[in-house]
């Protein structure tokens, strides 16, 4: 079976998260992709997304958050630039196929920013760093926005648990790393 | 130990296929993408592709579409890479080798196989 | 593509000399550069990571600096074993590649 794990980063605040989510390429190469955060109890809430089709290496930058498609390599990448203490929480990729579900993907993000910058291991880029050159031709994309009480989730339960999605057998396994990137003066 | 061993030297004919293994060790063989580099005698490194894997979702580049295939086996904490169709000028040394976290966009590799020699000759 | 091009190609050089190699990339790749050492018959080893980190139970002569598209990797006094071939590669986006590699020898 696929786990479906939650990867925990301690940035500090102005620092940059840099992950990426992989997709099966032949189905969701130019599917329309997504940023989400997830507060407990309520619904997943989109922060952004890739154009419709989504566009091969295309960078779409909605406020501090920068996604990048690579059809080519099934990866979705994403950045969150200038982090904020407010910025901790949740987050996941999701693939857009209406009308059906939205599609999960791999690894949920834990998120976890602190105050104050230091020289110590925890992230790729400081703010000084921040100033990324995205095309002129960069477009918000227009999300949509999905209601179904399936997407609700709840916070990562303590114990395993299992997890439907469309093409997998899933399970949901408890955090077992944290993840400090070095910081880039 | 942690480390990475990889399936002994193939001699191939145009045309044909050839399957390397990697077997992952000490370490969460499904936490850290599979990368394959490769590197023609007496030449540079080359880049293949990548491999989750968890999800065993894999992507390569343009110039092996097609043509290379990276699957894995995560209850033997096995990764292979199938290319097909070879040419004389895919005979090199072909290395496996760890990257970041799965979810990282961390693309150093700080684990390396020893290399599979593949030559191909009619 | 992001072409990644070290000078120079090979160097000869002694034994505590201090070493330096170039690294320039095509476009601006912001720290996203790891450098690696390869000796004949062996696998590459990974020495510097995200430009100027050094990976762990590498030696402290090696240091690396740059950023953009400007890179450098230096060798502070070079040990016997340090004559190999090394690499620069880039991650900022994909596909990842090397550069074209420097052989050291001993002069």
């Known amino acids: 079976a696929t786990k479906l794990t939650e990867e925990k980063y301690e940035l500090k605040e102005g620092q940059t998260l840099d992950v990426k989510c992989d997709y099966t390429l032949e189905k969701f190469a130019s599917s329309q992709k997504a940023w989400q955060i997830i507060r407990d109890g309520e619904m997943p809430k989109t922060l952004a997304c890739t154009e419709r089709p989504s566009k091969n290496s295309h960078p779409v930058q909605v406020g501090r958050i920068i996604l990048e498609d690579y059809h080519d390599h099934g990866l979705l990448r994403v950045r969150m630039v200038n982090l904020q203490v407010e910025d901790s929480g949740l987050y996941q990729c999701v693939i857009y196929q209406p009308p059906k579900e939205p599609h999960m993907l791999f690894d949920r993000i834990r998120l976890v920013v602190t105050k104050g910058f230091s020289g110590t291991p925890g992230s790729n880029e400081n703010s000084t760093q921040n100033v990324y050159k995205i095309p002129p031709t960069t477009t918000k994309a227009l999300c949509p926005l999905y209601t179904s009480p399936r997407t609700v989730t709840q916070a990562p339960p303590k114990s395993t648990a299992d997890v439907s999605t469309p093409d997998s057998e899933i399970n949901l396994t408890n955090v077992t790393d944290i993840i400090r990137v070095p910081v880039f003066n | 130990q942690v480390q990475l061993v990889q399936s002994g030297a193939e001699v191939k004919k145009p045309g044909a296929s050839v399957k390397v293994s990697c077997k992952a060790s000490?370490?969460?063989?499904?936490?850290?993408?599979i990368n394959w580099v490769r590197q023609a005698p007496g030449q540079g490194l080359e880049w293949m592709g990548w491999?989750?894997?968890?999800?065993?979702?894999?992507g390569s580049v343009q110039k092996f579409r097609g043509r290379v295939t990276m699957t894995r086996d995560t209850s033997i904490h096995i990764a292979y890479m199938e290319l097909s169709s070879l040419r004389s000028e895919d005979t090199a040394v072909y290395y496996c080798?760890?990257?970041?976290?799965?979810?990282?966009?961390?693309?150093?590799?700080?684990?390396w196989g020893r290399g599979t020699l593949v030559t191909v000759s009619s | 593509d992001i072409q990644m091009t070290q000078s120079p190609s090979s160097l000869s050089a002694s034994v505590g000399d201090r070493v330096t190699i170039t690294c320039q990339a095509s476009?601006?790749?912001?720290?996203?550069l790891n450098w690696y050492q390869q000796k004949p018959g062996k696998a590459p080893k990974l020495l510097i990571y995200?430009?100027?980190n050094l990976e762990t139970g590498v030696p402290s002569r090696f240091s690396g600096s740059g950023s953009g598209t400007d890179f450098t990797f230096t060798i502070s006094s070079l040990q016997p074993e340090d004559f190999a071939t090394y690499y620069c590669?880039?991650?900022?986006?994909?596909?990842?590649?090397f550069g074209q590699g420097t052989r050291l020898e001993i002069k």
């Open positions: 491999m989750n894997p968890n999800s065993g979702n894999s």
């Open positions: 000490g370490y969460t063989f499904t936490r850290y993408d």
């Open positions: 995200d430009a100027a």
């Open positions: 590669q880039h991650y900022a986006n994909l596909p990842i590649t």
């Open positions: 080798a760890r990257g970041g976290y799965t979810s990282s966009w961390r693309w150093y590799f700080d684990l």
């Open positions: 476009q601006d790749i912001r720290k996203h």
